[in-house]
């Protein structure tokens, strides 16, 4: 085949190749962009600066290597476009720096720099934090700062991350009223901060306030939603990324909720309960206090993370005809009280008065004459027959 | 498949406190079932002790309930018995099991109450 | 009063029924489950609520309750049935739970 004269040549089926001496100052309009999965420029020392634009349209690029160039600068963002790459080699170029932000979010297997005259300050602590880790492939490149010594030998006391305090009200918080959260970061090269509030939704009206170092945050008008929804501030220097998360608790009284009683591999008396905080349950059985056993007990499903309400079962184990009645779920937290009650019906009373049976003399604890429903077990297939008469 | 396994002193003095251990395995002890204690008198039938779940509700066999404490302990998979002011008459095997139907036991620790 | 009451001892035939019972007030209320015990063994449990058997307890062992007595009943006894059995339930108050005496079934 004819040697190729472009400045950048077809490599297998879907790599390229752009080798010819200084043809290249930008990756722009790159033949065949959309299928590469593999780039490979070497001797390019216009190609000085590498931003987001340039690897645009590139989204099925695994394996990028820029070489023997002239790479100055390279965006935070440049690979955003990218984010299966896999393999990056920067090496012999001019790089000083490479900033955290430029690797976040992909998957690199291997991350080439050797060759660069990097300078070593705080902005490369996370570098060096591949090093020490063993990610990447860079212990082995042994990365050398310019007239400074090895990488892995940097002081790094002082390059730590954004610090963040986020300041709540310790006041109880109502439905309805405004809450002001600040939060203050600290640390050396702040760049950015913020709040993440994707949780909130309708929870309340969002004011934000301020700006470094002292963020504040109202919420105003609040609602018992904004509860477990966490409240996020976040920071970022040279040397990575700070998030702290909070959450507000709004106090509201407790609410309960009583379904009909269902068979499963046990009984299980369905209930919802609510309020904050979380209130406390007590069953009646009857009008009287249940004491809970392995036979006859509370259980809570799994809550979920983002909320107050929980669910879960009076569950009853193999149930008799002295469990039927009315059952009443008591939920209470400093902010009021509620109840809910429901009649259950687990099987017959074996004890029924039967004109040709003996006269029964029924020793069951509480008074079984009312259900409701269908019983569930036929008399017939009641375990207990009546044989005790009296006189 | 759930294991129960006791371990504790096999000789507690009298007027002493009888501690016993069992450690849950194959199954967490933060599940949908209560854990029980029961004991047996060399030669004799078995008797309840008492019983607890995850979330602390507890109950006692009345004529020990003076004596006896059940805890749980959650992040170590075991809950534990004490009996207190023990005398000869609590010489047993202690079995610990899975209530409520003592489906699954543990093979029993004899504890012998001597000075 | 909070009390499951056994025959001491029965016997049974190779391969012929044998029902052992037990009598308690709290049995008109309460399911009765039932235990196998083998000397130096811990119990084992063969039947449990409204009849029921756990995996791996053959169908021969049933249970049944008629007024204050509950029963299990060995349909064709083997010789590895030959063990103490114990019955239980909870207390007439719900609150705690009793056993039997127990009862030495011996297998002839």
């Known amino acids: 085949a004819a040697p190729c004269p472009d400045a950048c040549c077809p490599h297998g089926s879907s790599g390229l190749r752009c080798t010819r001496d200084g043809a290249l100052d930008s990756l722009h309009h790159l033949p065949g962009a959309e299928n590469l999965t593999e780039l490979y420029i070497e001797n390019q020392q216009h190609l000085q600066h590498l931003e987001l634009r340039d690897l645009r349209g590139l989204g099925e690029l695994r394996n990028l290597t820029i070489v023997k160039s002239g790479l100055r600068f390279v965006a935070p963002d440049a690979f955003h476009f990218t984010p299966r790459l896999s393999r990056l080699n920067l090496s012999f170029n001019a790089l000083e720096s490479l900033s955290w932000k430029t690797v976040q979010g992909l998957s690199l297997q291997e991350l080439v720099l050797s060759g660069n005259p990097l300078h070593c300050s705080c902005a490369l602590r996370w570098l060096q934090r591949w090093e020490e880790e063993g990610l990447g492939g860079v212990p082995e490149q042994k990365l050398q700062c310019h007239g400074q010594g090895p990488l892995a030998h940097m002081p790094n006391a002082s390059c730590g991350v954004p610090t963040l305090k986020v300041q709540v009200p310790n006041a109880s918080v109502d439905v309805g009223d405004d809450v002001l959260l600040r939060c203050q970061v600290e640390g050396r090269g702040l760049e950015q901060a913020g709040w993440i509030l994707t949780e909130l939704e309708q929870s309340a009206t969002v004011m934000k306030s301020g700006g470094l170092p002292s963020l504040g945050l109202t919420l105003a008008n609040v609602t018992s939603d904004l509860n477990r929804k966490n409240v996020t501030c976040w920071a970022e220097n040279d040397v990575g990324r700070a998030e702290v998360s909070v959450q507000v608790n709004v106090s509201f009284p407790a609410s309960v909720q009583l379904h009909t009683a269902v068979e499963m591999h046990h009984w299980c008396i369905p209930f919802s309960v609510d309020g904050q905080p979380a209130p406390s349950l007590r069953w009646l059985f009857n009008g009287s206090v249940l004491n809970e056993t392995s036979f006859i007990f509370t259980e809570f499903l799994e809550p979920a993370a983002n909320e107050t309400v929980r669910h879960g079962c009076l569950r009853l184990n193999q149930p008799t005809h002295v469990n039927n009645g009315n059952y009443t779920l008591l939920a209470a937290n400093p902010f009021g009280q509620a109840s809910a009650s429901i009649m259950a019906a687990f099987m017959d009373n074996p004890f029924e008065f039967n004109p040709e049976d003996p006269i029964p003399v029924s020793f069951s604890p509480v008074d079984t004459n009312s259900t409701s429903g269908d019983p569930v077990e036929k008399k017939d297939e009641t375990p207990f027959g009546v044989s005790v008469a009296v006189g | 498949e759930v294991q129960l396994q006791e371990s504790g002193p096999g000789l507690v003095k009298p007027s002493g406190t009888l501690s016993l251990t069992c450690a849950v395995s194959?199954?967490?002890?933060?599940?949908?079932?209560?854990w029980t204690w029961v004991r047996q008198p060399p030669g004799k039938g078995l008797e309840w002790i008492g019983e607890i779940y995850h979330r602390g509700n507890r109950n006692y066999n009345p004529s020990l309930k003076s004596r006896v404490t059940i805890s749980v302990d959650k992040s170590k998979n075991q809950f534990s018995l004490k009996l207190s002011s023990v005398t000869a008459a609590d010489t047993a095997v202690y079995y610990c099991a899975r209530a409520p139907w003592f489906d699954y036991w543990g093979q029993g620790t004899l504890v012998t109450v001597s000075s | 009063s909070s009390e499951l009451t056994q025959d001491p001892a029965v016997s049974v035939a190779l391969g012929q029924t044998v029902r052992i019972t037990c009598q308690g007030l709290?049995?008109?209320?309460?399911?009765a489950s039932w235990y196998q015990q083998k000397p130096g063994q811990a119990p084992v449990l063969v039947i449990y609520g409204k009849n029921k058997r756990p995996s791996g307890i053959p169908d021969r062992f049933s249970g049944s309750s008629s007024g204050n007595t509950a029963s299990l009943t060995i349909t064709g006894a083997q010789a590895e049935d030959e063990a103490d059995y114990y019955c239980?339930?909870?207390?007439?108050?719900?609150?705690?739970?009793?056993f039997g005496g127990g009862t030495k079934l011996t297998v002839l």
């Open positions: 709290s049995l008109r209320s309460y399911y």
């Open positions: 239980a339930s909870q207390a007439s108050s719900g609150n705690h739970l009793i």
């Open positions: 194959g199954g967490s002890i933060s599940s949908s079932n209560w």
